[in-house]
């Protein structure tokens, strides 16, 4: 199935200049949506503290092709990566140099996808054979989660068992598009 | 596994309302997007609406449009579809259905049990 | 609204093969419709077959497949077996917004 597909094969990750040439992390069979900018859906993170404004973590942008067995995408699409462990805003950029590296105490915090968007995606493939109309999930934004040992263990099955399985946020409605606009439209990505 | 249970049968006045519910079990329902279809007896399949991904917001059919409120609770993850202004050629199964939890996005993958709603005088 | 359409009913015989069509009041069903082929049995809720034109589901039984045939959607059935008849919708996607066709109902005799 395309699932499995998109994890053997798009491999192909093109690092946008001024980010870490790394690989983003296996991506796991997670799914998380965004609501309605009207909807009925609230955001809601029950495990933060009122102070999670203040701390921070890193969104690395990937840009890669997506694969379907023999198929790749016509064009690559451009995608985040959370990344980083999470700690309070004002000490990231120089913590190191201070020698004031933020050690957590208590709860953890964990870097994790925020909020996904879905996009139409058109696969090209070899010797003639049909070209494929799939619609991926992307991360859109990402957030710093807080983490307590009460939780279920199906939150945690996103990114390995560190992280919880973030929720659906608000996004602004992107411009609209017709029916046919089925490929990558990185112009509007993030 | 996603698992989606619905509320009991209803029977309405033309002129009313009806709320009908699905509890989402096996994920929460902020990691679905959900949908809503019906089925008048002996009938096809109808999709009343439901929430668009790509958009980032709930679209309704258009027949629907006015009539029709989808919401949810995420503190139970449970979904509501409201249907006001009964008429009796709204009696039919009302189903929701979430798509998957996977890479790639595919509607309609789960689906409820049904609800019956009979509108009748 | 877009009307979407397919055959009232069909029959085939055991191990034999049918195609249900689905077709589209605004023109050529495309790819970027990413249709949806459900089954429905009596008394009980749809499943899907197929989404994105071709793409199985692990419950999906190998000898349905989907395509795209002379401007419509198609689900073949290569092999009926007697546990195939049921009716068949179609579902295709006008950029967010879904209609289903009026259904299919295939006998297997």
């Known amino acids: 199935q395309g699932w499995q597909a998109f994890k053997n094969d798009a491999t192909e990750i093109i690092p946008e200049l001024g980010e870490y040439p790394e690989p983003p992390p296996e991506l796991e069979n997670n799914k998380t949506m965004n609501r309605a900018e009207n909807g009925g859906r609230p955001p809601h993170h029950p495990f933060e503290t009122k102070d999670v404004s203040e701390y921070s973590c890193r969104e690395l942008h990937f840009t890669r092709y997506v694969t379907d067995g023999p198929c790749r995408s016509a064009k690559p699409v451009t995608e985040l990566v959370c990344s980083g462990q999470c700690g309070p805003a004002r000490l990231l950029p120089n913590a190191i140099g201070r020698g004031k590296w933020w050690r957590p105490s208590g709860p953890d915090f964990r870097c994790i996808p925020d909020r996904y968007r879905a996009q139409r995606v058109q696969l090209l493939c070899p010797g003639g054979e049909a070209p494929r109309a799939r619609k991926v999930r992307l991360v859109a934004s990402c957030k710093c989660k807080r983490l307590t040992r009460f939780h279920n263990q199906s939150e945690l099955k996103d990114f390995g068992t560190e992280a919880a399985r973030p929720q659906k946020g608000r996004k602004p409605r992107p411009r609209a598009r017709s029916a046919k606009a089925n490929q990558a439209e990185l112009e509007n990505a993030y | 596994e996603v698992q989606l249970v619905q509320s009991g049968a209803e029977v309405k006045k033309p002129g009313a309302s009806v709320k009908v519910s699905c509890k989402v079990s096996g994920y929460t329902l902020t990691e679905l997007s959900m949908h809503w279809v019906r089925q008048a007896p002996g009938k096809g399949l109808e999709w009343m609406g439901g929430f668009d991904p790509e958009h980032g917001e709930t679209i309704y059919a258009q027949k629907f449009q006015g009539r029709v409120t989808m919401t949810e609770d995420t503190s139970t993850d449970t979904a509501y579809m409201e249907l006001s202004s009964l008429r009796s050629e709204d009696t039919a199964v009302y189903y929701c259905?979430?798509?998957?939890?996977?890479?790639?996005?595919?509607?309609?993958?789960?689906w409820g049990q049904g609800t019956l709603v009979t509108v009748s005088s | 609204q877009a009307v979407v359409t397919q055959e009232p009913s069909l029959t085939v015989s055991p191990g034999g093969t049918v195609t249900l069509t689905c077709g589209s009041s605004t023109g050529s069903v495309t790819i970027d419709h990413y249709p949806y082929w459900f089954q429905q049995k009596p008394g009980q809720a749809p499943r899907t077959l197929i989404s994105?034109?071709?793409d199985k589901h692990s419950w999906t039984p190998a000898r349905f497949s989907g395509s795209l045939l002379g401007g419509k959607a198609a689900l073949t059935l290569s092999g009926a077996q007697p546990e195939d008849e049921a009716e068949y919708y179609c579902?295709?996607?006008?950029?967010?917004?879904?209609?289903f066709g009026g259904g299919t109902k295939l006998t297997v005799l």
């Open positions: 259905a979430t798509d998957s939890v996977s890479f790639w996005e595919k509607f309609f993958q789960h």
């Open positions: 579902l295709l996607d006008y950029g967010g917004s879904f209609v």
């Open positions: 994105d034109t071709d």
